[in-house]
């Protein structure tokens, strides 16, 4: 069964800067990745970035840089200033649309006890929705 993993990390150098990494563990080809915060995309969450493997990347503040890390994983750096900056308990969600599996989404947040610069290992997060 395909799985999605989500890893959230607070940068040691900028305490209000976050890096979100997400990956898809499946055999299908990824057609689209949507990263949101505040909950799943379409269920109260706000889209931060949409990544297409060939067409390009779209991102919105406070997202600073979204990029593909591999053919099945992405990373997103968030700016940490202003009213729309993330906080330690913010939930981030990644939705991978894949053919032929369908859509798979998982969410994660900063581990409660993590020190700046540390993060939980990128283990598969619970799958919230599979369309």
């Amino acid at each position: 069964t395909p799985e999605v993993w989500v890893q959230v990390r607070m940068e040691a150098t900028e305490l209000s800067s976050f890096t979100i990494r997400c990956g898809f563990l499946g055999s299908g080809s990824i057609s689209l990745v949507t990263v949101s915060w505040g909950g799943p995309n379409g269920a109260g969450g706000t889209t931060l970035a949409v990544l297409h493997p060939e067409r390009g990347i779209r991102q919105w503040a406070p997202a600073r840089q979204a990029r593909w890390e591999t053919q099945s994983s992405i990373s997103l750096i968030l700016e940490g200033s202003g009213a729309s900056s993330p906080c330690a308990n913010t939930t981030f969600c990644c939705k991978f649309a894949s053919f032929p599996e369908g859509s798979w989404e998982a969410c994660g947040s900063l581990p409660p006890s993590s020190d700046p610069g540390l993060s939980a290992p990128p283990t598969p997060a619970p799958i919230l929705r599979a369309d």
């Epitope: 706000t46 949409v50 060939e54 390009g56 779209r58 919105w60 990029r67 591999t70 053919q71």
Partner: antibody, heavy 114, light 113 residues
Framework: QVQLQQSGAELVKPGASVKISCKAT????????IEWVKQRPGHGLAWIGE????????NYNEKFKGKATFTADTSSNTAYMQLSSLTSEDSAVYYC???????WGQGTLVTVSA | DIVMTQSPSSLSVSAGEKVTMSCKSS????????????LAWYQQKPGQPPKLLIY???TRESGVPDRFTGSGSGTDFTLTISSVQAEDLAVYYC????????TFAAGTKLELK
């Protein structure tokens, strides 16, 4: 199928403002950016910016900040671009587009003339 | 901003000819993570909006005839029309889809000889 239908041509006076609409059908309007592109004869294509209708998040080309303002109404699947303090340099065809420029509206001609 | 440059600015061709046009970017459009080039090609006919032909430097958009081929990587790209048809006469634009703001080249006008 996906369609983007733009409002009709506008003739406006210098210094005035104009609001162009772009109605989207055939896809989930809130999930993908509506991009706005300017085309003047001899000046090619220039990206003005984009709005993500679901959250009203925007990105503007620095060259058009203060000139263009984007809004979107998810209840009618319509995006809007307002152009302010118009001059002859703003006379152009303006296009809306979506899904990484795969789909385009037919264009709206804005003519600024006294 | 990434500057896109196309050459030649115009091409005069006969039906059935093979045509190539070049596009160069001031910065690499290659995403090292997934080895994809974020470059697109468009065709625009008079009085019409641009039409997406190629994305990802080499992937044809659905419905685009296979006589259109995109190639290249990094900063140098090419659009090839294997056998020009009358309906291909138009202006062709390449576009940086790698980073904000998306930028377009000035275009190559394909004319009939």
């Amino acid at each position: 199928q996906v369609q983007l239908q733009q409002s009709g041509a506008e003739l406006v006076k210098p210094g005035a403002s104009v609001k162009i609409s772009c109605k989207a059908t055939g896809y989930t309007f809130s999930s993908f950016s509506i991009e706005w592109v300017k085309q003047r004869p001899g000046h090619g294509l220039a990206w003005i910016g984009e709005i993500l209708p679901g959250s009203n998040s925007t990105n503007y080309n620095e060259k058009f900040k203060g000139k263009a303002t984007f809004t979107a109404d998810t209840s009618s699947n319509t995006a809007y671009m307002q152009l302010s303090s118009l001059t002859s340099e703003d006379s152009a065809v303006y296009y809306c587009s979506s899904y990484w420029f795969a789909y385009w509206g037919q264009g709206t001609l804005v003519t600024v003339s006294a | 901003d990434i500057v896109m440059t196309q050459s030649p600015s115009s091409l005069s061709v006969s039906a059935g000819e093979k045509v190539t046009m070049s596009c160069k970017s001031s910065q690499s459009l290659l995403n090292s993570g997934n080895q994809k080039n974020y470059l697109a090609w468009y065709q625009q006919k008079p009085g019409q909006p641009p039409k997406l032909l190629i994305y990802g430097a080499s992937t044809r958009e659905s419905g685009v005839p296979d006589r259109f081929t995109g190639s290249g990587s990094g900063t140098d790209f090419t659009l090839t029309i294997s056998s020009v048809q009358a309906e291909d006469l138009a202006v062709y634009y390449c576009q940086n889809a790698h980073s904000y703001p998306p930028t377009f080249a000035a275009g190559t006008k394909l004319e009939l000889k």
